[in-house]
């Protein structure tokens, strides 16, 4: 790859235009911040490929790395890549902006890192400080990269002076994630117990032969010591376990239990903590809310879910209209309560292919010897609308009537529309909505009945047409929350000898 000008560092004037050229034996491309800026690519007669990147109206924000690379490095011997660094000194740009990934620097070990504060002018003097600190830190600075060194867990800022003003960078946060050579895990048989029950905790260390365990726990602070038992899990190499067992827990045993493990050879240590709650008596608590009105769609399956916390494990019952529900042999109802965490439960009632008869008042009751809770809701079965009848008639009055009847739940609403040009409807011409218009061309009368047994509404609507002078396509559309249905009839004038 050949780059012109060769660099490796260029200082360009603000507002100027500059041309970078890269050529190679295979297609080449310029890259800037992992993207390909607009550029002109060409192939010469001698088979050489080139790419020309024209930088116009340069600002300080154009400062940074530019790479020329082969467009497709597959099949090439090396992934050759040429790097060029451009500075555009710009007094209006202090430090180049950083994204969040650059401002927060996480480490897992003591290693050299770079605080990437960069300026647009290589002549500027840049200093590193603790955030809100005045003393400059003795860390080497590279204008193309930033300050490199081994840093403590602190926040840092860079400072420079542009003209007569002091400019600060964003703060950089160095944070060391704790990764120790000892890996401790602590768990409890139960993290919630009732007073009088036992607390049992285990602390496990892997991969160390000689370790010392130290437990801290609420009882210890009051001078009542409990002797832990240390054993080896013989089925695994160097798995050492310490067991802390407190019989007949008291309310004062609630709190944080910490297992601290030290290994004296390399002076490594690690600790883990777990919270234990001792409750006076058991509890059942609902989590979140379930609306008092729930919906299900006819012939579809519906799962109703209740989330709650409880200790000890409760009994869960479901009722419909005060009658106990159980898993039906026909597979129409499925009940399940699962333990999603130590004290959290999800109880589900699944209605398979919902029927109208399954509407009603449902209650979930969760209880044990200490507490109980119940949650109730009304289940409404939604039925998609159906147009059951659309008929046209000629009363003696001379007007023509169209009657539309349909059913659904929730209550359907009705939309009448008509189309006068039968050849072009409805594809080319939108239908005209009909109703109680001021023109008195049509009148509408709608009645709604609720059928208790079927638990759905019936809508009957009659459209009166004053004078029909040519064939008319009349459409009745019923709509509700779960669907719509349409039927169409052609109304012809009295005078015409045929009807469709």
């Amino acid at each position: 790859l050949v780059v012109t000008p060769p660099g490796p560092e260029l200082v360009l004037n603000v507002s100027s235009t500059f041309v970078l050229t890269c050529s190679g034996s295979a297609p080449v491309v310029w890259e800037r911040m992992s993207q390909e800026p607009p550029q002109e690519m060409a192939k010469a007669q001698d088979g050489t490929f080139s790419s020309v990147l024209t930088l116009t109206n340069l600002t300080g924000l154009d400062t940074g790395e530019y790479f020329c690379t082969h467009n497709d490095s597959r099949g090439l011997e090396t992934d050759e890549r040429k790097r060029l660094y451009i500075f555009v000194p710009d007094p209006t740009v202090g430090f180049l902006p950083n994204d969040a990934e650059e401002l927060f620097i996480f480490l897992t070990e003591i290693t050299e890192i770079t605080i990437p504060c960069r300026v647009t002018d290589p002549q500027l003097v840049v200093t590193l400080h603790e955030k809100k600190g005045d003393v400059a830190l003795p860390v080497p600075y590279d204008h193309q990269r930033g300050f490199s060194g081994i840093f403590e867990d602190r926040s840092y800022i860079c400072k420079t002076t542009i003209g007569d003003r002091e400019v600060d960078s964003d703060a950089y946060y160095v944070y060391r994630l704790q990764v120790s050579s000892i890996n401790v895990s602590v768990n409890a048989v139960q993290t919630v117990v009732r007073q009088g029950e036992n607390i049992t905790l285990m602390c496990i260390v892997i991969g160390n032969e000689v370790v010392n365990f130290e437990w801290t726990y609420p009882r210890k602070e009051s001078g009542r010591l409990v002797e832990p038992v240390t054993d080896f899990l013989l089925d695994m190499p160097y798995h050492i376990r310490s067991i802390l067992h407190i019989p007949s827990a008291e309310l004062e045993d609630s709190g944080t239990y910490t297992c601290n493990v030290t290994e004296s050879v390399n002076d490594h240590q690690d600790e883990k903590a777990i919270n234990i709650t001792v409750v006076e008596s058991g509890y059942v608590r609902l989590l979140g809310e379930v609306g008092t009105l729930q919906f299900a769609e006819l012939h579809r399956s519906r799962t109703l879910q209740v989330v709650f916390e409880a200790y000890p494990p409760p009994t869960v019952l479901w009722f419909k209209d005060n009658r106990t529900l159980g898993d039906s042999s026909a597979g129409e109802i499925a009940l399940s309560t699962r333990n999603v965490s130590e004290t959290r439960y999800v109880s589900e009632l699944t209605l398979v292919r919902v029927k109208v008869a399954e509407a009603g008042h449902y209650t979930m009751r969760a209880f044990h010897e200490d507490a109980e809770v119940q949650l109730s809701f009304q289940l409404q079965i939604n039925v998609p609308v159906r147009v059951l009848e659309l008929s046209e008639s000629h009363p003696d009055s001379g007007e023509q009537t169209v009657r539309c009847r349909g059913r659904g739940m929730p209550q359907p609403n009705i939309i009448w529309s008509a189309c006068r040009d039968l050849k072009r409807c409805p594809r080319e011409l939108p239908p005209t909505l009909l109703g109680n218009s001021s023109e008195e061309e049509s009148q509408l009368e709608t009645n709604v009945t609720y059928w208790e047994e079927e638990q759905e509404f019936e809508v009957v609507s009659t459209l009166r047409l004053q004078h029909v002078d040519r064939p008319l396509s009349v459409r009745c559309t019923l709509r509700n929350a779960v669907g719509q249905d349409t039927q169409e009839v052609i109304v012809v004038p009295h005078s015409l000898p045929f009807k469709v």
């Epitope: 994204d99 969040a100 401002l103 996480f106 600060d168 703060a171 946060y173 944070y175």
Partner: antibody, heavy 127, light 107 residues
């Protein structure tokens, strides 16, 4: 040099609307989460809402959900709080704050607090 | 929502005293807790984040400790500039909650 300046507070009637603005300077605004925090007269601090760098995530305290809307314009280095259906209990000094939420580390979130605050703007809801 | 309860609500102390303020969370928040100082008519000022990390520029007489549900802010030797209201604040899945505040006043 790092600064947040709020504006837009005023006296408004219950049910009315107001739009607060917060203008940032001295830092890369587009790299930070931002929050609104309020303080009723003589009372403590209450977090109201926050917004991620590119507006993909917004969170609100329950009492303002559906009434308040947080937004930002990174090009203008500005944060906004649109407040509708205002209630007497929304009367407070409203602060904007820079919220130090680093990018996620695996499944682990970190948090370094709200390190830069504005001087506050007063919203009074009264008939 | 996670509730934070600070105690005491008011604390009377003298210059040079060692002062401890407690913040309890209604459920475990690991160490996602920050402490702020606020003076009348001013915006809050971050003192400590991640339960125990001192914010840059904050005097070393301030320290924080705790994890899970119980946290403390300690001022080792109270200075005249420290008479103010102190708030704890938790972070959990991007929502925030503040404690009700502890006013440190001159005895």
């Amino acid at each position: 040099q790092v600064q947040l300046v709020e504006s837009g507070g005023s006296l408004v009637q219950p049910g009315g609307s107001l739009r607060l603005a917060c203008t940032a300077s001295g830092f890369t605004f587009s790299s930070y989460w931002m929050s609104w925090v309020r303080q009723a007269p003589g009372k403590g601090l209450e977090w109201v809402a926050n917004i991620q760098q590119d507006e993909n995530e917004k969170y609100y305290v329950d009492s303002v959900k559906g009434r308040f809307s947080i937004s930002r314009d990174n090009a203008k280095k500005s944060l906004y709080l649109q407040m509708n259906s205002l209630r007497v209990e929304d009367t407070a000094v409203y602060f904007c704050a820079r919220d130090l939420v680093p990018p996620r580390q695996g499944d682990y979130y970190h948090y370094f607090g709200m390190d830069v605050w504005g001087q506050g703007t007063t919203v009074t809801v009264s008939s | 929502d996670i509730q934070l309860t600070q105690s005491p609500s008011t604390l009377s102390a003298s210059v040079g005293d060692r002062v401890t303020i407690t913040c309890r969370a209604s459920q475990s928040i690991s160490d996602w807790l920050a402490w702020y100082q606020q003076k009348p008519g001013k915006a809050p000022n971050l003192l400590i984040y991640k339960a125990s990390t001192l914010e840059s520029g904050v005097p070393s007489r301030f320290s924080g400790s705790g994890s899970g549900t119980e946290f403390t802010l300690t001022i080792s030797s109270l200075q005249p500039d420290d008479f103010a209201t102190y708030y704890c604040q938790q972070y959990n899945s991007y929502s925030r909650t503040f404690g009700q505040g502890t006013k440190v006043e001159i005895k």
